[in-house]
């Protein structure tokens, strides 16, 4: 925050230490700052060319002294304009200017390609004060140049809002060719053409490219970088690389493998993760993808029962996550399961088949033909039924569960009876007279209780009524049967 507009709040350059020795009296060189590491660069250039002052960017600041003396134009002295050197060599270059002591707050800074080099630890500045002027030599050194050091360097001095700019010093770092684009590994279809690209730069230019396939040169004549190699097609895997040549020597790219796409190998390690009565969860380890990503997989399921018709169920699924739940299987059944996967070329062979079994389940259907009749003499209700079809028992029958509900004048009472698996009839005591009895039966296996049959109703009269015909399970669609007496 400064009053004078011309006195900019702008940083001045970095003068790194340590400095050897201390400041002397006014007329000896001040702040002579050698390279911090003590390294003597391989290339050094004189700060000035005697004689001609630089005329490109001259500032005649709009300031006069107390005595109104006009000021001479200020300019950096000419210096070397272009430095060519090899990578990893050292370089030192500088710009110099004589500043009249009227300018008591100059700032000097180094710039590269239009950007200020802030905090550059290799910039040093020497001051040579005199009664009238201070000679300033700003040096910039790089101990081991890299390609990134290529560019145009300038000094800038700010004085009273005027900017004085030195002539550019072009640094050109030469070295072996440097790859900007190298061939990349590819997976290709057999006998199908494809391209490989190789690009390298200097300096020095030009850079010429040779292609190499399986250690043998492909092209007799070099191609100027960048180069595109068109390979008409391969029948087997090959390794390609490119050589980049310039006047400094040769650089070889990485070798890249070109693979031929093929059908995948069969999946391995198909395993059972979980089994229920009607489903099996399987997982598998995919085989080698044949250099082409898997698209999907097919699960093949066969009944292992020798009496089965040998038909195969096929379930298609995505290639990931190597997991599939096979559904709609029969309970307590044995199955052979195999997995095959495909890529863009085709299907793999089927994995080794594995044997899997479903567990026992609850029956899937209720007992059939349920009939109910009143045996008035013994004050019992007789119930008869037919067991569910074997295939739908989903396990070994262990018995039946009978639900009988008694309803009379707004009172309702449900009772459950367990019956052993033998036989297909049961007798229950009359609980309430002058009431309706509703009966339902479910088959039971170790896998659980199956669905209850449709309800069958019978009216139980008061004592002394005659025994009438039984109630039975209605035909589908009929209303609940009720025996009216």
């Amino acid at each position: 925050a400064i009053t004078e507009a011309r006195e900019e709040a702008k940083p001045y350059p970095l003068f790194p230490g340590p400095f050897p020795g201390s400041l002397q009296t006014d007329h000896t060189p001040l702040l002579s700052l050698p390279h911090a590491s003590g390294y003597q660069p391989a290339l050094m250039f004189s700060p000035t060319q005697p004689g001609r002052p630089h005329t490109g960017n001259v500032a005649i600041p709009q300031v006069t002294s107390v005595e109104s003396k006009p000021l001479p134009p200020l300019a950096f002295k000419h210096t070397v304009g272009h430095i060519i050197l090899s990578e990893h060599k050292g370089v030192k270059f500088n710009c110099s200017i004589s500043v009249p002591n009227i300018y008591q707050d100059t700032t000097i800074s180094w710039w590269k390609d239009g950007k200020e080099l802030l905090g550059a630890h290799h910039a040093i500045t020497q001051f040579y004060p005199d009664d009238e002027v201070t000679a300033i030599i700003a040096s910039f050194s790089i101990t081991s140049v890299q390609r990134s050091d290529n560019g145009s360097y300038i000094c800038k001095m700010k004085i009273n809002n005027e900017e004085i700019v030195s002539d550019p010093i072009y640094i050109e770092v030469q070295g072996l060719p440097h790859f900007t684009k190298q061939p990349e590994s590819m997976n290709v279809t057999r006998n199908t053409a494809f391209n490989l690209t190789c690009q390298a730069v200097g300096p020095p230019e030009p850079v010429n490219i040779f292609w190499v396939q399986n250690s043998s040169r492909v092209n007799e004549q070099p191609e100027k970088s960048p180069s595109v190699l068109t390979v008409p097609g391969l029948t087997e895997m090959a390794v390609f690389s490119c050589e980049a040549h310039n006047d400094k020597g040769l650089t070889v790219s990485k070798g890249v493998q070109i693979n031929i796409k093929a059908i995948p190998s069969p999946p391995t390690e198909v395993s059972i993760r979980n089994s229920t009565a009607h489903s099996i969860l399987i997982s598998w380890v995919p085989g080698f993808d044949g250099y082409s990503p898997f698209r999907n997989c097919s699960i093949q399921v066969k009944e292992a029962d020798p009496l089965s018709n040998g038909s195969v169920m096929i379930f298609n699924t995505s290639a990931l996550p190597h997991l599939y739940q096979i559904k709609q299987l029969q309970a307590l059944a044995n199955y052979s399961i195999g997995v095959s996967c495909m890529n863009e070329i085709g299907w793999s062979a089927v994995s080794p088949w594995i044997l899997a079994s479903t567990t026992e389940g609850a029956p899937s259907v209720a007992p059939l033909n349920v009939t109910v009749f009143l045996n008035e003499s013994s004050d019992n209700v007789d119930i008869r039924w037919m067991k569910p079809p074997t295939k739908q028992q989903d396990g070994e029958l262990v018995g039946y569960r009978i639900s009988h509900v008694w309803q009379s004048a707004g009172i309702s009472k449900e009772l459950l009876e367990e019956v052993g698996q033998n036989g297909s009839r049961a007798r229950i005591s009359v609980q309430v007279h002058n009431a309706t009895c509703t009966v339902r039966i479910a088959a039971v296996t170790r896998g659980g209780v199956g669905p209850f049959s449709d309800p069958v109703k019978i009216f139980i009269p008061a004592h002394g009524w005659v025994d009438y015909a039984p109630s039975s399970t209605p035909a589908p669609g009929n209303a609940d049967p009720v025996l009216i007496i």
Epitope: A1, I2, T3, E4, E7, A9, K10, P11, Y12, P13, L14, F15, P16, G17, P18, F19, L23, D26, L30, L31, V63, T64, S65, V66, V99, P100, N101, I102, Y103, Q104, D105, T106, T107, I108, L118, G119, T125, F127, P129, D131, T134, I136
Partner: antibody, heavy 120, light 107 residues
Framework: LIQLVQSGPELKKPGETVKISCKAS????????MNWVKQDPGKGLKWMGW????????TYADDFKGRFVFSMETSASAAFLQINNLKNEDTATYFC?????????????WGQGTTLTVSS | DIVMTQSPKFMSTSVGDRVSITCKAS??????VAWYKKKPGQSPKALIN???NRHTGVPDRFTGSGSGTDFTLTISNVQSEDLADYFC?????????FGGGTKLEIK
């Protein structure tokens, strides 16, 4: 021997004006700018600004615009700090400090300080 | 404005010891930091400029280091005449700003 010798202590009343001098010797006065620094009693240092001793052009920090005037007299190799319309908060020690080399902004030599007391 | 935070405020040491005073800048000031010593009733004396460059006549017991935002003044083999206030100055950007100072006492 480079020296900056400041004028003696001052006792002033609010509203008055004071002018503190800083006499340089042992070097060419017009080759180095002169800075002014304030130190409040028991407090730290505050940069007030500087004067270009070749052109006489002053530069003030924000807090010291208005009542503060930097001036110089080349023939006497002296720089001056004038404070107008004094306030109690101007009570402090004021230092002059010479700028180092041309392209740098640090101070290499300081005056011994002038104590100003403003009190009614 | 750039704030210079100096620590410690007070330091007690013995003759022959080694002490370090630090200044932390609120933004990058490259190597533009100076260190000064002030004894009561005397003018401040320049010790270090440009972070590590010793001023004329300053004993090599005084060493400056640092760049960017963190700076240190180290006094090795402390002597009785080193009893003083020490402060830093950033001279990278206007307005120039000082650290709060460190009072060094000799036991």
């Amino acid at each position: 021997l480079i020296q900056l010798v400041q004028s003696g202590p001052e006792l002033k009343k609010p509203g008055e004006t004071v002018k503190i001098s800083c006499k340089a010797s042992g070097y060419t006065f017009t080759n180095h700018g002169m800075n002014w620094v304030k130190q409040d009693p028991g407090k730290g240092l505050k940069w007030m600004g500087w004067i270009n001793t070749y052109t006489g052009e002053p530069t003030y920090a924000d807090d010291f615009k208005g009542r503060f005037v930097f001036s110089m007299e080349t023939s006497a190799s002296a720089a001056f700090l004038q404070i107008n319309n004094l306030k109690n908060e101007d009570t402090a020690t004021y230092f002059c400090a010479r700028k180092g080399v041309t392209a740098a902004r640090y101070f290499d030599y300081w005056g011994q300080g002038t104590t100003l007391t403003v009190s009614s | 404005d750039i704030v210079m935070t100096q620590s410690p405020k007070f330091m007690s040491t013995s003759v022959g010891d080694r002490v370090s005073i630090t200044c932390k800048a609120s933004q990058n000031v490259r190597t533009a930091v100076a260190w000064y010593k002030k004894k009561p009733g005397q003018s401040p004396k320049a010790l270090i400029n440009l972070a590590s460059n010793r001023h004329t006549g300053v004993p090599d017991r005084f060493t400056g280091s640092g760049s960017g935002t963190d700076f240190t003044l180290t006094i090795s083999n402390v002597q009785s005449e080193d009893l003083a206030d020490y402060f830093c100055l950033q001279h990278w950007n206007y307005p120039l700003t000082f650290g709060g100072g460190t009072k060094l006492e000799i036991k």
